[in-house]
Interface confidence: low
């Protein structure tokens, strides 16, 4: 607020025109830079005689109060006008002059001391910075305000951005408010159009198209963004996108491969892990179908190892003692050695073994070499009582005490030497490289069980109790057909899947019989020379409860999935797979389909020159490849027969295989007891 | 959808050949195998042979020496050819899709071995 | 070769009556396939791999078994079933089929 009168003389008393509250009147809205609106005097010739009157009566001649009412016609102004008056008069007419003069506004004479008394406007009672103009009234004033302005004084700027009838003062953005105006301003990234109101965005992409560098700019009310794919962050500095290492970030509980873009967790499969649902923790990879591996000592097991003898005894016996081996056999093989016999100095030998299913019978000694293959096929699962026995002009083989073969000889199988008939007898193998004296070649590998043998009639003393110890080389107790991949290792076989009379230049068809014991692991994989794996078909627990999902992949693509398969369970699954460079067909007990779709074009043509170089085929799981190489890198666990290509897999044949998989033997599924 | 039908002679003398074409659509001979199987009149069926897609062919022992399957990719074709029909000859002769088990089977071609 | 005989050979069952017939192989087999024959028709896919019904085959069929018996069920005989049903073994070459069993409706 202003201070008034700041021209009183300095020994006066100063009056301050003070607007009492109730004589205020509010302007409105549309009034708000007007003039306050006063009752004054309706002529100004009538301004100009009070004028002269005042000269004349108060001036010129000294008036009493009474003389003033007179000039004024009115009591209000005349009570304001005669106490200053007499201020006046005191000041000029009591020699006060000096005093007067030297204050600051002093008036000059009386009469202008008196004539200014009567104009409000003398001194300036408006706000300097918002009056237009200032007029006088009968003891009062009017203040004409400036736009922006209002208070009986324009002593208050109107803030237009408030103002309810114009909201933010029509700015679309910022509205700041100055004294006696307002202007609108924008946000950064904004500009002002002509309007002086609106803000329109900057589009700084377009402005400045190498703004993100590499990165994707993007354009935001008032900003823009560079946007990086997935897996990438925005580099300031280089304006680029970088990938982002989660592995840094410890995001996997196991294996982690970052990759551009993105990243993989992988779980050890060979160590009996899998990723669990959140594709970053790993757990143990569970058993869905129990099976009953219980194993009896008392049954030998012949496959323990895939290449070698499982056991071998020496015999030394007096001359007259004659060759003789019966013994309870048990398998689902085809082929294989049950027993080699031979002198001490190898120039003599006996072959038991299995070809066809049937007893076969090799033999060589100085006097002859002869084979017979005869009797039933006793590759039936069933325990079958195999006695061959050597009699004084021939040697008669015998199953279930039943004569099948009767083999002539001239003479002794095996010579005795200083009285004593020394013979050295093997089990389910041979114990050197004996392929090239064979009468005819035979695949040596036998998966097959044998119990309450007796050896030259020596009965079982002294086996039994190394067989005893060790656990490998005991037989499980039931068995069914197949072959048992144990989770912990492979089969590899070199198969040519190259056809030159097809006009698609390979194929390769598998049918698998499956009938896991756990639900994930890799079934079969064809492998590159380069650590690939240009196809492969595993199991994956499916996110549908006690289901299995089928997954074909093309190296660590899966191309396709088969969902929800009820494959843990006693009964057996046929699957079948047709592969070429062209297409994918499958069958499995739902449905028999084609699959095509654009993406497996790309990923067979993938398939397609890896197919043209050498692959190799593993059964059961992986080499040593990369973690990242398949989608799955765990052990198969369970039974499963493989026809590659019309034939069937026989992992005798096998380039290598682990010891503990089962050729042609697989536990039975384990049945829950009433006593369990 | 899948569709197979036969195209045969009807009468053929007896010591003379038979071809039969089983034309199909739906399907590429590329990726399914298709089987010849026969139906005497009033009897059961008896399988003859089929060609895999990849071409190669399997027969039923006791006609193989008289029996050649054969195929055209390209035209949707398979051939049959048997060599010195009998009597015993006459049968009802299906072709069927055969993807491990024949699952769509033509309508026949009815062969009567007849002087 | 496999021969598969089925039984019964002719048959006639009275609708809502269970019906079961019967294939027995001389050796084992890993799976049997059935087929549905009616008069003048060719034969259809009905049962494959011992226990997968073909598609568009009523849920009351069903096929089992193992080794060297298998068989296929109707759990309630209806009209439309009155039919020639032959099983078929593809284990060993040459896939062989049984000779039939005429199922009529009483």
């Known amino acids: 607020m202003r201070v008034l009168g700041g021209r009183c003389g300095a020994l006066l008393a100063c009056l301050l025109l003070v607007l009492p509250v109730s004589e205020a009147n509010f302007l409105s809205k549309q009034q708000a830079s007007q003039v306050l609106v006063r009752k004054r005097r309706a002529n100004s010739l009538l301004e100009e005689t009070k004028q002269g009157n005042l000269e004349r009566e108060c001036i010129e001649e000294l008036c009493n109060k009474e003389e003033a009412r007179e000039v004024f016609e009115n009591d209000p102004e005349t009570d304001y006008f005669y106490p200053k008056y007499l201020v006046c008069l005191r000041s000029f007419q009591t020699g006060l002059f000096t005093a007067a003069r030297q204050s600051t506004n002093a008036y000059p004479d009386l009469r202008s001391c008196v004539n200014a008394i009567p104009d409000q406007c003398s001194p300036l009672p408006c706000n300097e910075d918002g009056y237009m103009s200032c007029k006088d009234g009968k003891a009062s004033f009017t203040c004409t305000c400036k736009p922006g302005w209002q208070g009986e004084k324009c002593e208050f700027d109107i803030n237009e951005c408030k103002d309810p009838s114009n909201i933010n003062g029509g700015c679309s953005q910022i509205c700041d408010n100055t004294p006696g105006s307002y202007h609108c301003s924008c946000k950064n990234g904004f500009v002002m159009l002509s309007n002086k109101k609106d803000c329109k965005d900057v589009d700084e992409c377009s402005l400045k198209p190498s703004i993100c560098g590499t990165a994707v700019c993007k354009n935001i009310p008032g900003d823009f963004e560079c946007e990086c794919p997935e897996g990438y962050r925005y580099n300031l500095k280089s304006k680029s996108c970088e990938d982002i290492d989660e592995c840094s970030e410890n995001m996997c509980a196991q294996l982690c491969v970052n990759y551009p873009g993105g990243y993989t967790c992988y779980c050890d499969g060979k160590k009996g892990f899998k990723l669990a649902q959140d594709q970053k923790s790993c757990e143990v990879v569970s058993v869905c179908l129990p099976l009953n591996l219980d194993t009896k000592y008392e049954l030998l097991y012949l496959a323990e190892q895939f290449a070698g003898v499982v056991l071998y005894l020496k015999f030394r016996l007096p001359e007259i003692s004659r060759f003789s081996a019966e013994f309870d056999f048990r398998t689902y093989d085809s082929e294989g050695v049950i027993l080699y016999a031979e002198s001490i100095d190898h120039s003599a030998w006996l072959l038991i073994a299995l070809r066809g299913g049937k007893i076969e019978v090799q033999l060589k000694n100085e006097h002859t070499s002869k084979i017979t293959t005869g009797g039933d096929v006793i590759n039936n699962g069933l325990w079958n009582m195999v006695s061959v026995e050597e009699l004084e002009h021939s040697i008669s083989i015998k199953i279930a005490k039943e004569a099948v073969m009767d083999i002539n000889k001239p003479g002794p199988l095996f010579k005795p030497e200083n009285g004593l008939l020394e013979t050295k007898v093997y089990f389910a193998g041979f114990p050197r490289k004996v392929e090239s004296e064979l009468i005819k070649p035979i695949n040596p590998r036998l998966d097959g069980c044998i119990r309450s043998w007796n050896l030259m009639k020596q009965g079982a003393s002294g086996i039994k109790e190394i067989i005893q110890e060790k656990q490998n080389k005991h037989c499980l107790v039931t068995v069914e057909k197949g072959s048992y991949y144990p989770g912990s290792g492979i089969a590899q076989f070199h198969i040519d899947y190259n056809n030159v009379s097809s006009a698609e230049g390979w194929h390769v068809n598998v049918t698998l019989n499956i009938r896991p014991s756990t639900g994930t692991g890799v079934m079969l994989a064809l492998v590159s020379g380069n650590n690939t794996v240009p196809f492969a078909v595993s199991l994956v627990d499916s996110t549908s409860e006690k289901s299995q999902d089928i997954l074909l992949s093309v190296e660590n693509t899966v191309i396709y999935r088969i969902q929800a398969l009820s494959l843990c369970s006693d009964q057996q699954s046929h699957l079948e797979f047709r592969v070429n460079r062209n297409n994918l067909e499958l069958s499995t007990p739902l449905k028999i389909e084609t699959i095509s779709h654009e993406d497996l074009q790309r990923q067979l043509a993938v398939l397609d020159k890896a197919m043209k170089a050498k692959v190799a085929t593993y059964l059961g799981g992986l080499p040593d490849v990369p973690f990242s190489a398949t989608p799955v890198n765990a052990f198969y666990n369970g039974c499963m027969e493989v026809n590659i290509n019309g034939v069937q897999l026989d992992l005798d044949e096998a380039i290598s295989k682990h010891n503990d998989i089962r050729a042609h033997s697989c536990p039975s599924v384990w049945k829950k007891t009433k006593n369990s | 959808q899948v569709h197979l039908k036969e195209s045969g002679p009807g009468l053929v003398a007896p010591s003379q050949n038979l071809s039969i074409t089983c034309t199909v659509s739906?399907?590429?001979?590329?990726?399914?195998?298709v089987s010849w199987v026969r139906q005497p009149p009033g009897k059961g069926l008896e399988w003859l042979g089929m060609?895999?897609?990849?071409?190669?062919?399997d027969y039923n022992s006791t006609l193989k020496s008289r029996l050649s399957i054969s195929k055209d990719n390209s035209k949707s074709q398979v051939f049959l050819k048997m060599n010195s029909l009998q009597i015993d000859d006459t049968a009802r002769y299906y072709c069927?899709?055969?993807?491990?088990?024949?699952?769509?089977w033509g309508q026949g071609t009815s062969v009567t071995v007849s002087s | 070769q496999i021969v598969l005989t089925q039984s019964p050979a002719i048959m006639s069952a009275s609708p809502g009556e269970k019906v079961t017939i019967t294939c027995s192989a001389t050796?084992?087999?890993?799976?049997m396939h059935w087929f549905q024959q009616k008069p003048g028709t060719s034969p259809k896919l009905w049962i494959f791999?011992?226990?997968n019904l073909a598609s568009g085959v009523p849920p009351r069929f069903s096929g089992s078994g193992s080794g060297t018996s298998y068989s296929l069920t109707i759990s309630r005989m209806e009209a439309e079933d009155a039919a020639t049903y032959y099983c078929?073994?593809?284990?060993?070459?040459?896939?062989?089929f049984g000779g039939g069993t005429k199922l009529e409706i009483k």
């Open positions: 069927a899709r055969d993807p491990g088990a024949m699952d769509y």
């Open positions: 739906g399907f590429s001979l590329t990726g399914y195998g």
């Open positions: 060609i895999w897609g990849d071409g190669t062919t």
């Open positions: 050796s084992s087999v890993t799976y």
């Open positions: 791999s011992t226990s």
């Open positions: 078929q073994q593809r284990s060993s070459y040459p896939p062989t």
